[in-house]
């Protein structure tokens, strides 16, 4: 090999030992039956060499660097060449690095052609191994800019009083340009200026100065982005860290073309701005530290840019002003992560705050739009409390559990809608009334409506879940004892065309023992199935809970147990079930841990069952399913 | 709900010291700074500075170096300031609030009911 | 330190009535100002964060607006519980100072 490097030119080549290998046998730079480790070349110098192995690219890295001096005569702008030409030189790993020293009144900027680049993280490399290095100086101190790839949207960094770019190139690529130009630019008043270009959907993640360390202290860095007119941005900060400042505090500006507040000022904790069509400013501005315990500044960040979708311009007015106790959020479903570009689904407050999701809260109107390519990827869930304080004023007082159409209006889909029923303890009590009989869901009868109703305690320490119950059965009121929630939980979006059988009204009335008692008002022409509280985890020790069912005059009801013991196991106490006639009062009383249960019975008036359970041991709980059906009465027994 | 629970009244004699909680409930007490502010009749209302558990430390106003000290412990969710070297002019109404992020740089969002202190011989 | 000067410093007004009560700091503090009403005997209650925005749960009759230098406080239709000493505060920059207070007392 031969390296020639011209007077003047600034140029210094080293060749050097990369990182060791555990390659057993050694490799040297052969100049004249020398053998060396390390040769410099220096401007106006010529060497000639060669390698002592077959693959020095496996021991030996190559760096070439020029000096560009523009403090003492004009600045060389333009097209930066690769110099020596890559064809000169070994096939090693070479880091070509130009450091381009100016005044502090001159702005230079960088420009790259395409394709972009695209800033990786600590610890990230690039695909192709082809990396730029871009520093910057402060009076003497040396700053990172940051470390980026090929194929990204930064098309120009602007710096002043100078800029020091390494360009790193694995040994077997082809790359014989720079890729890049300099041209000086009026001072830019700040560390630097990154230009960042969409020509489309996408995004880009960016960091501040010297990421993971701290940003300069006092410093002021700007990223523009250009945005094409008819898409939409929005930033979300991925990472950051606050120093210890001394007065004024670190801040981020947005300047956004068209707003009303240039430039909009938020502190790093804030929600930023979404929904910005076209171009803008983000600027990040440090603080003064304190001296004893500075701390650090730092900021990852990302863009998306996406189409707006239909819905980005509408605005939806959602009135809680005489709402009370009520908070509405709007969220992200569940999903399985993709790893394929996936546009961003927004909600946004006042058109410009956006997140992915958005708590409203009663007392106030709110206007909210969204930015979002498929609504069905969010949802809503809503919470209210309905409290009772004074049990003389609430006693018999009645309240509407239906989902306003303010929130029925939205074109996001309604998961659940909760409503917490709060009572005086050992003073009230609660009846639910649905507008339509409910039907209990079963794995014999399961709910196919669009929604149920899941009922549940509302007592933190009481694990109690009454049931899930849908439209179209046979109960006709549910009464509990104490604080409860219920929950509207919608199954499909035909929920929007079903949402006229919703309708459950609440009354407090007085207090009473039992943890629940049903209604149940069977029609001739179905089975009802019902089933304890808490299914599946076994009814509360030491809880009772009754059905009192109704018989028409003309029918006969049928009651079947779907086994044949009830499996509790008693660790203190009894369990017990008593059914009774409404009529006689005559009742029959079955031990549910020791009697085998009732055979099939048939009731010809109105009866109760009741059921208390013990404290069962662990493991063996209270479980019951049973069925009632009523047929016509053959014989007239009255 | 959140709350933030401030200790009672205080009579102390002029040149003593005394400590202040406050108590924060129904929230992450961590995630959350705590400012303390007071209330007198001379100088309405007053920053004395904030305690940031999320960035571990305190800021003062510089009228008040030396005169208040704010500690955390985090085992009981609880804020304190000491007031040292007292004179007749620290009797006033002393509130936490809080920060209404993990820094020190938000609005205060929720305040506790202030402490009452007296400052007399 | 920022000034925050705050009128006028008292007032009296009917119910239902429309109440503006300004802020001006001695500097532009990039809307970072919150206002908080203390009613007698109780703590101070935050309504209005960034200049304009209603903290949950706040009525909507009350309102915020102002930048740079100038903040306005708005309560559209007064209410009795709605009297108490109502304080702006400035979270631009350390430290934290506030206004001097505006009594609202029901005519």
């Known amino acids: 090999f031969e390296i020639a490097l011209p007077r003047e030119s600034n140029i210094t080549v080293l060749i050097k030992l990369g990182t060791p290998t555990l390659l057993a046998k050694p490799c040297y730079i052969v100049i004249s039956k020398r053998h060396i480790t390390m040769l410099s070349i220096k401007s106006g110098e010529r060497i000639v060499f060669t390698f002592s192995c077959q693959s020095p690219e496996n021991h030996f890295v190559i760096e070439i660097q020029k000096n560009i001096d523009c403090m003492s005569g004009p600045c060389p702008f333009g097209e930066v060449q690769l110099q020596p030409s890559t064809s000169l030189l070994p096939t090693l790993n070479r880091t070509f690095i130009w450091d381009v020293k100016a005044h502090k009144s001159i702005g230079l900027e960088l420009q790259f052609s395409i394709p972009r680049l695209r800033q990786i993280g600590p610890g990230e490399s690039c695909p192709d191994g082809v990396t730029h290095s871009i520093s910057g100086r402060i009076d003497a101190t040396v700053v990172r800019i940051g470390t980026f790839c090929s194929n990204g949207t930064v098309s120009r960094i602007k710096m002043q009083e100078g800029v020091k770019m390494a360009l790193h190139l694995p040994w077997f690529h082809p790359r014989n340009v720079s890729g890049f130009s300099i041209a000086n630019r009026s001072s830019i008043k700040r560390l630097c200026i990154i230009e960042s270009v969409f020509e489309g959907e996408g995004s880009a993640t960016l960091m501040s100065a010297n990421y993971p360390e701290g940003f300069p202290e006092d410093e002021l860095m700007t990223w523009q982005f250009v945005v094409p007119a008819h898409l939409r941005a929005s930033v979300s900060f991925l990472n950051f860290n606050l120093s210890n400042c001394e007065r004024k505090e670190e801040r981020v500006e947005y300047y956004i073309p068209g707003s009303t507040t240039n430039p909009e000022v938020f502190k790093l904790e804030d929600k930023q701005p979404g929904n910005m069509a076209g171009n803008f400013n983000l600027s990040l501005q440090g603080c003064d530290q304190d001296a004893q315990s500075p701390g650090i500044l730092r900021l990852q960040f990302q863009v998306l840019v996406q189409h707006p979708q239909n819905e980005s311009n509408k605005i939806y007015v959602v009135d809680l002003s005489n709402e009370r106790a009520m908070s509405l959020t709007i969220e992200p479903r569940p999903v399985k992560q993709s790893r394929k570009f996936v546009p961003g689904c927004f909600v946004c407050l006042e058109s410009r705050t956006c997140s992915s999701n958005l708590t409203l809260t009663s007392g106030s109107k709110h206007k909210i739009s969204f930015l979002c390519d498929d609504l069905t990827r969010l949802w809503m869930n809503v919470e209210k409390t309905i409290s009772c304080t004074d049990h003389r004023y609430c006693q018999r007082k009645s309240y509407s559990l239906q989902v306003p159409s303010d929130i029925l209006h939205l074109p996001v889909e309604l998961h659940d809608f909760s409503w917490k029923l709060l009572v005086p303890k050992d003073r009230l009590s609660l009846v639910l009334v649905p507008a339509q009989k409910l039907q209990q869901h079963t794995h014999e009868k399961p709910c196919n409506t669009s929604f149920s109703y899941l009922v549940a305690s509302a007592i933190p320490s009481q694990d109690l879940y009454f049931g899930s119950f849908c439209p179209g059965g046979s109960i006709k009121q549910i009464q509990v004892k104490q604080n409860i929630s219920v929950t509207l939980r919608t199954f499909a979006p035909s929920f929007q065309q079903e949402a006229s059988r919703q309708g459950l009204t609440v009354s407090f009335i007085p207090y009473f023992k039992e943890e629940g008692v049903f209604t149940v008002t069977p029609d001739t022409k179905s089975k009802v199935y019902l089933r304890t509280p808490n299914w599946d985890r076994g009814l509360p020790s030491l809880t009772s809970v009754s059905w009192n069912i109704s018989v028409p005059r003309d029918q006969v009801a049928c009651l079947t147990f779907f086994k044949e013991r009830s499996g509790v196991v008693c660790q203190t106490g009894r369990a017990f079930m008593i059914i009774q006639e409404q009529r006689t009062r005559a009742e029959e009383i079955f031990s549910l841990d020791e009697d085998v249960l009732p055979k099939p019975s048939f009731h010809h008036h109105s009866f109760w069952v009741n059921i208390s359970n013990c404290s069962p041991t662990s493991g063996k709980q209270l479980d019951l399913l049973f069925s009632v059906t009523l047929t016509p009465r053959t014989v007239d027994l009255t | 709900q959140v709350q933030l629970q401030q200790s009672g009244p205080d009579l102390v004699r002029p040149g003593e010291s005394v400590k202040i909680s406050c108590k924060g409930s129904g929230y992450t007490f961590t995630d959350h700074a705590i400012h303390w502010v007071r209330q007198s009749h001379a100088k309405s209302l007053e920053w004395i500075g904030v305690?940031?558990?999320?960035?571990?430390?305190?800021k003062y106003n510089q009228n008040f170096k030396g005169k208040a000290t704010m500690t955390v412990d985090k085992s009981s969710n609880t804020a304190y300031m000491e007031l040292a070297r007292l004179t007749s002019e620290d009797s006033a109404i002393y509130y936490c609030a809080r920060d209404c992020y993990g820094s020190n740089r938000g609005y205060f969002d929720y305040w506790g009911q202030g402490t009452t202190l007296t400052v007399s011989s | 330190d920022i000034r925050m000067t705050q009128s006028p410093s008292s007032m009296y007004a009917s119910l239902g009535e429309r109440v503006t009560i300004t802020c001006k700091a001695s500097?532009?503090?990039?809307?970072?100002l919150s206002w908080f009403l203390q009613r007698p005997g109780k703590a101070p209650k935050t309504l209005i964060y960034?200049?304009?925005n209603l903290v949950e749960g706040v009525p909507s009759r009350f309102s915020g607006s102002g930048s740079g230098q100038d903040y306005s406080l708005i309560i559209s239709n007064l209410e009795y519980e709605d009297m108490g000493i109502y304080y702006c505060l400035q979270y631009d920059e350390f430290p934290r100072t506030f206004g001097g207070g505006t009594k609202l007392e029901i005519k």
């Open positions: 305690i940031s558990f999320s960035y571990d430390n305190t």
């Open positions: 500097q532009d503090i990039n809307r970072f």
């Open positions: 960034r200049a304009n």
